[in-house]
């Protein structure tokens, strides 16, 4: 927790941010909360980015004030205006770009004082993997596909029955650049699969970790997948 200290007689107010990651091409949230103030017209929210001359976003007197906004953020930012009164200064960032990564400062002024907190924002691409039985292959084979990742992730296979086994010798992973020349499609194939077992395809980079599970029995196939961002920590 980082507490913003007041300057020149004003009290300090607590401002809290959460490090987060943005999925390029999609919308992201830069999270920031502060001690609420009942005087909405006195609240000022400023978002700044290290190395950027203009403001990322400014909200004051109940509305956006974008005259000082940096060109790279033009038309891409918004606060949750109806939530400001209860202490939510989070910023919605539209169409996240790779270049949006960096250190942001959420700076708050209220009638009670001032405070700020920094936020590390990572950008990349991450997506949910899907594991399927590859019926085209000559032997029992699983195929794990995830459409968008960046930076290039690692792919590791695991199995419930053979816990701790190393599947690198019986798997093959490829990365195919997508049309926008940044993100890549991940395809990993696992050979010599046995029936009545649960296999997991784990894809991970420094931003996210995703797992696709498949359970193959004689009568049915069950799939499950989940994705987790790695660097969400409060400041």
């Amino acid at each position: 927790l980082i507490i913003g200290f007041g300057i020149s007689g004003r009290h300090s107010i607590t401002v809290t941010t959460v490090a987060s990651a943005g999925n390029i091409g999609e919308d992201g949230i830069l999270s920031c909360t502060f001690e609420p103030d009942i005087k909405l017209s006195d609240i000022v929210i400023q978002w700044l980015k290290e190395g950027v001359l203009g403001l990322v976003h400014e909200f004051k007197e109940g509305k956006d004030e974008l005259s000082e906004q940096d060109e790279m953020f033009r038309g891409r930012t918004a606060v949750f205006a109806d939530q400001v009164i209860v202490g939510n200064a989070s910023l919605r960032l539209k169409n996240v770009q790779l270049t949006d990564a960096g250190t942001y400062k959420c700076y708050i002024i209220t009638s009670k004082g001032k405070g700020n907190a920094n936020l590390e924002y990572k950008t990349g691409a991450f997506s949910m993997p899907e594991v399927n039985v590859d019926y085209n292959a000559s032997s029992e084979t699983l195929r794990c596909e995830a459409p968008r990742w960046f930076p290039q992730p690692t792919v590791v296979w695991a199995s419930q029955v053979d816990q701790g086994a190393n599947f690198s010798e019986v798997s093959n992973t490829s990365f195919e650049l997508n049309s926008e020349n940044v993100t890549m499609k991940v395809v990993s194939v696992l050979y010599n699969v046995t029936i009545n077992n649960t296999y997991s395809c784990m894809i991970e980079n420094d931003i996210a970790k995703a797992t696709g599970d498949i359970k193959v029995t004689e009568s049915e196939i069950k799939r499950r997948s989940h994705l987790q961002l790695l660097n969400s920590k409060a400041s």
């Epitope: 009942i38 006195d42 109806d82 202490g87 009670k112």
Partner: antibody, heavy 117, light 107 residues
Framework: EVQLQQSGTVLARPGASVKMSCKVS????????MHWVKQRPGQGLEWIGA????????EYNPNFKGKAKLTAVTSATTAYMELSSLTNEDSAVYYC??????????WGQGTTLTVSS | EIQMTQSPSSMSASLGDRITITCQAT??????LNWYQQKPGKPPSFLIY???QLAEGVPSRFSGSGSGSDYSLTISNLESEDFADYYC?????????FGGGTKLEIK
């Protein structure tokens, strides 16, 4: 579930003081403003003031400065309002109301104060 | 202090009608306006926030609109449970102030 439970009906003499309570459950009491609103019989709503329990900060409607005193006991998640030098004009229903997700989003059931000699 | 002028102060309507209540502020309140419904002997209940957003559980026949200093609450296809008192609240500038209220009665 958010609940604001207010103390019961009060009968008081002119010139006396009364203290009413508002017990909060279901949200982080210390981190959000708690407000008090007055409603005279058959009349509209009038904002009295608010308290931020985490720091005991208070804000008052100028019309109620010296009339109302707001306090809170964080360990009991309870807000209090004391009204002093009571007159007939103070006879009303008094509501506590939170600003948790939005301004005045949850309300207590009200405390009826009757001032009579 | 911002004054909120609510009109009409009372009105009667029939089931199925569409009605509109207005609130005018003495200055621009930048959409910082909520609406509340109150039934006899009960506390007000949260209806609409930030001019046009419906509070949880509020039927879609209720809607709010406005900007600057002029705001309105519309109820379309009135139902029996809608007959009550309605109040607007501005929270843009200190102190927060309510409109005088509108009593909606059945015709």
């Amino acid at each position: 579930e958010v609940q604001l439970q207010q103390s019961g009906t009060v009968l008081a003499r002119p010139g006396a003081s009364v203290k009413m309570s508002c017990k909060v459950s279901g949200y982080p009491f210390t981190s959000y403003w708690m407000h008090w609103v007055k409603q005279r019989p058959g009349q509209g709503l009038e904002w009295i003031g608010a308290i931020y329990p985490g720091k005991s900060d208070t804000e008052y409607n100028p019309n109620f400065k010296g009339k109302a005193k707001l306090t809170a006991v964080t360990s009991a998640t309870t807000a209090y309002m004391e009204l002093s030098s009571l007159t007939n004009e103070d006879s009303a229903v008094y509501y506590c109301t939170s600003t948790w997700t939005h301004y005045f989003d949850y309300w207590g059931q009200g405390t009826t104060l009757t001032v009579s000699s | 202090e911002i004054q909120m002028t609510q009109s009409p102060s009372s009105m009667s309507a029939s089931l199925g009608d569409r009605i509109t209540i207005t609130c005018q502020a003495t200055q621009d309140i930048v959409k910082s306006l909520n609406w509340y419904q109150q039934k006899p002997g009960k506390p007000p209940s949260f209806l609409i926030y930030y001019t046009a957003q419906l509070a949880e559980g509020v039927p879609s026949r209720f809607s709010g609109s406005g900007s600057g200093s002029d705001y309105s609450l519309t109820i379309s296809n009135l139902e029996s449970e809608d007959f009550a008192d309605y109040y607007c609240l501005q929270f843009y500038e200190f102190p927060p102030t309510f409109g005088g209220g509108t009593k909606l009665e059945i015709k």
